[in-house]
Interface confidence: low
């Protein structure tokens, strides 16, 4: 009975090579797939008796593993079925075909190769979705989500990496980070800002070759405004004496923001100056080697009672400033708490 759509049969075939064992063919199947590995001699010439092995050990047929002379079937594939499969000549032990099998969580999307399409995907990468790559210039309003896609294939399955203006591009290079969806050959940037403008290049490569595609992103300015801070951040924290604490602040800004972390302090018993401005000390500010990502987090190590109090994330740009504050409460260590309790004191946090 043929499997239903949710349990696809995925076939992979390799040509029998000359005297040298074939290049190991990398293949990926989805969990639950019925896997077929075929070893076809050119022109249909008989290969003689063959055996199949997995990771060097001969495979024995079972209710789930069906072994034929030039074909191996594994039903309902699972992660344990991943490994190196080889089809060998039974007498000479010459390797006729070599497969490196990966089993992923998702069921395969059914690239169901027929016999006549043998190994058609072997070799250098190529674009599989040309019509989705026509739009090379993308102009989007600020705060929108942008997705660049470079759907490709090849054998072995190629890797994809991204460049921005010719340099390696990683999540820490922008506020809000990036999403790399390798399964979908895509780069996603949420809440784009003008500093995201530039040329984005996907580089798709395997050992047989490399292809690339460059997209140009233009971010259209909205009416300028001061930085926007994500609601609820930083959040109030309660910590035990001697523990570590992190405050987070998420900043969205069209113009390049300047981020500082401040702690509110008292001067001569007063929290504010004569003009009503709070007394603060700057704990963290942009330096030569500080990334925006690093500035979005304030880390306090081995906190003391002196660390308790009000902390502010201040973000400014050419238009103005925004700030959010949070409180840190420091509790005594458990032993101290027990001692105070026994003395009959009440601690109000």
């Amino acid at each position: 009975e043929p499997p239903g759509p949710e349990q696809r049969v995925v076939r992979r075939a390799a040509e029998v090579p000359g005297p040298e064992p074939s290049q190991q063919e990398q293949v990926a199947f989805g969990s639950g797939d019925t896997v077929e590995l075929s070893c076809h001699p050119p022109g249909g010439a008989p290969t003689g008796p063959t055996v199949w092995a997995k990771d060097g050990t001969g495979l024995v047929a079972s209710h789930r593993i069906l072994v034929g002379p030039q074909r191996l079937q594994v039903l309902n594939a699972s992660h344990e079925d991943a490994g190196v499969y080889s089809c060998q000549h039974r007498l000479t032990r010459r390797v006729l075909c070599h497969f490196s099998v990966r089993v992923t969580d998702a069921p395969s999307s059914g690239d169901d190769e027929d016999g006549e399409d043998v190994a058609e995907d072997t070799g250098a990468p190529y674009w599989t979705r040309p019509e989705r790559m026509d739009k090379k210039l993308l102009a989007v309003p600020a705060a929108n989500t942008v997705r660049f896609r470079c759907p490709a294939a090849g054998n072995p399955t190629p890797s994809i990496s991204w460049l921005k203006n010719g340099k390696e591009f990683r999540g820490e290079h922008r506020i809000g980070g990036i999403k790399l969806r390798h399964q979908q050959w895509s780069l996603v940037m949420e809440s784009v800002v003008p500093s995201d403008r530039g040329n984005y290049t996907c580089v798709v490569e395997n050992k047989f070759g490399s292809i690339r595609q460059t997209y140009t992103l233009d971010v259209l300015e909205r009416s300028p405004h001061r930085p926007i801070l994500q609601a609820g951040l930083p959040a109030n924290q309660t910590a035990i004496l001697g523990s570590d604490v992190e405050f987070h602040c998420k900043v969205y800004s069209d113009a390049q923001p300047h981020i500082q972390w401040l702690k509110h302090v008292e001067v001569n018993g007063s929290k504010v100056g004569p003009d009503g401005t709070p007394y603060v000390t700057v704990l963290k500010t942009a330096g030569a080697n500080t990334t925006d990502k690093e500035l979005e987090v304030l880390s306090l190590h081995n906190v003391t009672f002196e660390d308790a109090g009000e902390y502010t994330c201040l973000a400014g740009n050419s238009i103005g400033f925004s700030h959010h504050s949070a409180w840190l409460v420091v509790l005594p260590a458990e032993e101290e708490l027990m001692e105070t309790d026994e003395a009959g004191s009440v601690y109000a946090g």
């Epitope: 399409d117 979705r129 294939a153």
Partner: antibody
Framework: QVQLVQSGAEVKKPGASVKVSCKAS????????IHWVRQAPGQGLEWIGD????????SYAQKFQGRATLTADRSTSTAYMELSSLRSEDTAVYYC?????????????WGQGTLVTVSS | DIVMTQSPDSLAVSLGERATINCKSS????????????LAWYQQKPGQSPKLLIY???TRESGVPDRFSGSGSGTDFTLTISSVQAEDVAVYYC????????FGGGTKVEIK
């Protein structure tokens, strides 16, 4: 098992709008594109457009540009097709269907269809 | 837009006979980089949603009987049912997915 479940039949007057929904289950909604195809009684299949639920980016057949609006709600894994300024020739079964973001890019799963009748 | 033209409009065949449906695209749907034809075939039985039969012009979707086969390249394609069964009575559509999506007009297959 992937399923695309569409909203029920609609009867509309000419000039009105209709909004058909398509709820996806059994797979990651943002891993595929949702397409809308219609079929007038006794006629062939006609592609309306598609939406990428990840970003909301859409493409439309020229004929439907400006009259059809495709949207997607990632939180409920539901896609919507709204057709405005309805006329009698819009009477058709409207299907949602999907194409995977990997192979094979053909429409491998289809909804059951929603009959939209435009009549005064 | 790429226009897809199917022929014939309808086809009456005896059980067990061969049925051949043709599809022509107004421009090539073959992508030279991967040598794949961006063409699919669908089957629609009366009162049902369409069902994917063939993609990449010649690759059968899983679960589709092997009496269905697709061939052709560039602009000319053929769907062949090698031995028509009663359950094959349906309308068959070709569709290109090289540039957006367009369908052929459909071919109705009936039993003589």
């Amino acid at each position: 098992q992937v399923q695309l479940v569409q909203s029920g039949a609609e009867v509309k007057k000419p000039g009105a709008s209709v909004k058909v929904s398509c709820k996806a289950s059994g797979d990651t909604f943002t891993d595929f594109e949702i397409h809308w195809v219609r079929q007038a009684p006794g006629q062939g299949l006609e592609w309306i457009g598609d939406i990428d639920p990840e970003t909301g980016s859409t493409s439309y057949a020229q004929k439907f540009q400006g009259r059809a609006t495709l949207t997607a709600d990632r939180s409920t894994s539901t896609a919507y097709m709204e057709l405005s300024s309805l006329r009698s020739e819009d009477t058709a079964v409207y299907y949602c269907t999907r194409t995977y973001d990997g192979y094979p890019y053909a429409m491998d799963y289809w909804g059951q269809g929603t009959l939209v009748t435009v009549s005064s | 837009d790429i226009v897809m033209t199917q022929s014939p409009d309808s086809l009456a065949v005896s059980l067990g006979e061969r049925a051949t449906i043709n599809c022509k695209s107004s421009q090539s749907v073959l992508y030279s980089n991967n040598n794949k034809n961006y063409l699919a075939w669908y089957q629609q039985k009366p009162g049902q949603s369409p069902k994917l039969l063939i993609y990449w012009a010649s690759t059968r979707e899983s679960g589709v009987p092997d009496r269905f086969s697709g061939s052709g390249s560039g602009t000319d394609f053929t769907l062949t049912i090698s031995s028509v069964q009663a359950e094959d009575v349906a309308v068959y559509y070709c569709q290109q997915y090289y540039s957006y999506r367009t369908f052929g007009g459909g071919t109705k297959v009936e039993i003589k």
